[in-house]
């Protein structure tokens, strides 16, 4: 098994992840591991020399870069917040702030915007990943209601009057809860879901 630097006639190297073809010398050389950069280029007589990235810089992959990438903070003006700090091997991990979704994506999220409100009678469809897209509002399923305009309010089950020893005065809708009343006394309509003591 050849150890870098070694000659390559077909311009490809055995280990594509950890080696690269250097065209001036027509050889395969070692890449630098994550967290490091090339401090001296390889030649036919010397393999790549790597050095550790300085503080506040990183390289995420096996590379032949002559510099490390500068760590960048998550920009709150763009609606981003930090979930993991930058290390020599990994850039700062950001996500959209609560109530926001990613509106611009270029390998990673660069700009977040406020989630749209879901009107009464609907709720935001649950997504696999929070902050990945804007709300898609879906109607409350049968037996549930949601009575606000909100990006995050969830549909709640209608009150079951009988569980409170009450009777139904008015059925619930997608926008309102069931209205309950004391079986003995009529209740004003504004006291929906509650009992007059």
């Amino acid at each position: 098994q050849a150890v870098p630097p070694y000659a390559s006639e077909n311009q490809t190297c055995r280990d594509q992840e950890k080696e690269y073809y250097e065209p001036q010398h027509r050889i395969c050389c070692s890449r630098c591991p994550p967290g490091t950069y090339v401090s001296a280029k390889c030649s036919r007589i010397r393999d790549t020399v790597c050095a550790t990235c300085a503080e506040n810089s990183y390289n995420e992959h096996w590379n032949y870069l002559t510099i490390c990438q500068l760590c960048r903070p998550c920009d709150p003006v763009m609606g981003l917040e930090e979930i993991a700090p930058c290390t020599s091997k990994r850039k700062t991990q950001c996500r959209c702030q609560p109530g926001m979704f990613c509106a611009a994506w270029a390998l990673e999220c660069t700009h977040c915007e406020l989630l749209s409100d879901c009107p009464p009678g609907t709720e935001a469809e649950l997504k696999d990943e929070v902050g990945k897209g804007n709300n898609h509002c879906v109607p409350c399923k049968a037996g549930h209601f949601q009575n606000t305009s909100s990006p995050s309010a969830r549909c709640q089950p209608h009150t079951r009057c009988e569980n409170q020893g009450l009777v139904e005065a008015a059925p619930g809708t997608a926008q309102s809860d069931t209205t309950c009343k004391n079986p003995l006394e009529p209740l004003p309509p504004e006291m929906s879901g509650t009992m007059l003591m």
Epitope: P23, Q24, H25, R26, R44
Partner: antibody, heavy 120, light 107 residues
Framework: EVQLVESGGGLVKPGGSLRLSCAAS????????MYWVRQAPGKGLEWVAT????????YYPDSVKGRFTISRDNAKNSLYLQMSSLRAEDTAVYYC?????????????WGQGTTVTVSS | DIQMTQSPSSLSASVGDRVTITCKAG??????LSWYQQKPWKAPKILIY???RLADGVPSRFSGSGSGTDYTLTISSLQPEDFATYYC?????????FGGGTKLEIK
């Protein structure tokens, strides 16, 4: 038979430009890295430029970087050296040379050379 | 840059003599050294590559030896056509650098 024939040399004033050519024959030109090497009067040899087989990569020593440009036309089996901002110290015989394409990297064939004189 | 120090710069010898020319590299060049012969008004011609290997068509009186930083070209028995200038070249690391040359003259 491998042949490399340079042309384009001549007398040029300081600050002027010149384009050298090297016509290759007798081998598959597009398979080889090509070089320009020069020799000042009464002096030794100096590497001037390299170009990869497909022409994608070019390399120069600091002494000519930014002033000289190596190029090739594989369809025409030709190598070129565009020289600009010429100085008196660029006066030399310019040779084109082929680098063998195995694993030993020596110059196996050279042209006969073309003379460039930079003088006012 | 790797400095190549070639010695002697000139040498007088007679037909039949054994001659050695040396090249010393500024650092280990791992045998990436070739030797060239140049006659007046002619292009250089390859003699030895990878420090010790004789190029095609080159007479066996020419030989190369050495490793690391020290390399030698030997002509075992000088012939009249061998009077020329000889250059070493390191191509282990860019920029490629030549020795200053050794002019071999008839004594």
């Amino acid at each position: 038979e491998v042949q490399l024939v340079e042309s384009g040399g001549g007398l040029v004033k300081p600050g002027g430009s010149l384009r050298l050519s090297c016509a290759a024959s007798g081998f598959t030109f597009s398979d080889y890295y090509m070089y320009w090497v020069r020799q000042a009067p009464g002096k030794g040899l100096e590497w001037v430029a390299t170009i990869s087989d497909g022409g994608s990569y070019t390399y120069y020593p600091d002494s000519v970087k930014g002033r000289f440009t190596i190029s090739r036309d594989n369809a025409k089996n030709s190598l070129y050296l565009q020289m600009s901002s010429l100085r008196a110290e660029d006066t030399a015989v310019y040779y084109c040379a082929r680098e063998e394409n195995g694993n030993f990297y020596y110059f196996d064939y050279w042209g006969q050379g073309t003379t460039v004189t930079v003088s006012s | 840059d790797i400095q190549m120090t070639q010695s002697p710069s000139s040498l007088s010898a007679s037909v039949g003599d054994r001659v050695t020319i040396t090249c010393k590299a500024g650092q280990d060049i791992k045998s990436y050294l070739s030797w060239y012969q140049q006659k007046p008004w002619k292009a250089p011609k390859i003699l030895i590559y990878y420090a010790t290997r004789l190029a095609d068509g080159v007479p066996s009186r020419f030989s190369g030896s050495g490793s690391g930083t020290d390399y030698t070209l030997t002509i075992s028995s000088l012939q009249p056509e061998d009077f020329a200038t000889y250059y070493c070249l390191q191509h282990g690391e860019s920029p490629w650098t030549f020795g200053g040359g050794t002019k071999l003259e008839i004594k």
